[in-house]
Interface confidence: low
């Protein structure tokens, strides 16, 4: 799953590691626009 931040939120893309605080990282788990987020994020939640 690639990073999904809105155009308003492009510069937090360096916060990469998913948290253990959520069960899964679904597409609805982050805001929608992927075009301004260069860093892909892991889909794994331990």
């Amino acid at each position: 799953v690639s990073s999904a931040l809105t155009p308003h939120l492009p510069t937090h893309a360096d916060s990469q590691t998913p948290s253990t605080g959520t069960d899964t990282q679904t597409p609805s788990g982050s805001a929608a626009n992927t075009t301004l987020s260069p860093t892909p994020r892991s889909n794994d939640i331990s």
Partner: antibody
Framework: AVQLLESGGGLIQPGGSLRLSCAAS????????MSWVRQAPGKGLEWVSA????????FYADSVRGRFTISRDNSKNTLYLQMNSLRVEDTAVYYC????????????WGQGTLVTVSS | EIVLTQSPGTLSLSPGERATLSCRAS???????LAWYQQKPGQAPRLLIY???SRATGIPDRFSGSGSGTDFTLTISRLEPEDFAVYHC?????????FGGGTKVEIK
């Protein structure tokens, strides 16, 4: 276990300055964006500011922009909020919160530190 | 700025009853970017739901979230004594991140 411990709150006069700190442990601090969220007595939550994992990018609510500065020291696993030109309406409990993968929602919160701005 | 309005302000119910809390946004929230938190007196908020309907780790399945666009709902299917608290919704579709005013669920 993830722990976030805020400090630095207290009583301050209007126009004064205060620096809040949040000591983080139990996770790779530099990998996560962090935020400050505040709650005035008896009121709802208000997002104040956010900072990216590297510290290179910051966001602010309009109500504090130009007066507050968020920063972090990843070598010390500590988040800061420098508050200048404090106003009575800044009185609140200030929470440090760990973000999930970006400036989105918060999976861990500290217990908060009370800032009271009064003459 | 997206304004979130929660209703009712206070919900008076008995243990075992169903609680339905509403969060309405002033404009559509992209990708259902909405979270719900529980807060008890003197404590920090606790994440319950993200992405409008996904439960956070350790959250009992009596808590469920639904909705999209501008209307979102948190449902507690059967209230337990520990569920009486204030519930906040938060949108993260755009900055500034905003919260609703909260709904207090109190014992009737």
């Amino acid at each position: 276990a993830v722990q976030l411990l805020e400090s630095g709150g207290g009583l301050i006069q209007p126009g004064g300055s205060l620096r809040l700190s949040c000591a983080a442990s139990g996770f790779t601090f530099s990998s996560y964006a962090m935020s400050w969220v505040r709650q005035a007595p008896g009121k709802g939550l208000e997002w104040v500011s956010a900072i990216s994992g590297s510290g290179g990018s910051t966001f602010y609510a309009d109500s504090v922009r130009g007066r507050f500065t968020i920063s972090r020291d990843n070598s010390k696993n500590t988040l800061y909020l420098q508050m200048n030109s404090l106003r009575v309406e800044d009185t609140a409990v200030y929470y440090c919160a760990k973000e999930v993968m970006g400036p989105i929602f918060f999976d861990y919160w500290g217990q908060g530190t009370l800032v009271t701005v009064s003459s | 700025e997206i304004v979130l309005t929660q209703s009712p302000g206070t919900l008076s119910l008995s243990p075992g009853e169903r609680a339905t809390l509403s969060c309405r946004a002033s404009q559509s929230i992209i990708s259902s970017a909405l979270a719900w938190y529980q807060q008890k007196p003197g404590q920090a908020p606790r994440l319950l739901i993200y992405g409008a309907s996904s439960r956070a780790t350790g959250i009992p399945d009596r808590f469920s979230g639904s909705g999209s666009g501008t209307d979102f709902t948190l449902t507690i299917s059967r209230l337990e004594p520990e569920d009486f608290a204030v519930y906040h919704c938060q949108q993260y579709g755009s900055t500034p991140l905003t919260f609703g005013g909260g709904t207090k669920v109190e014992i009737k």
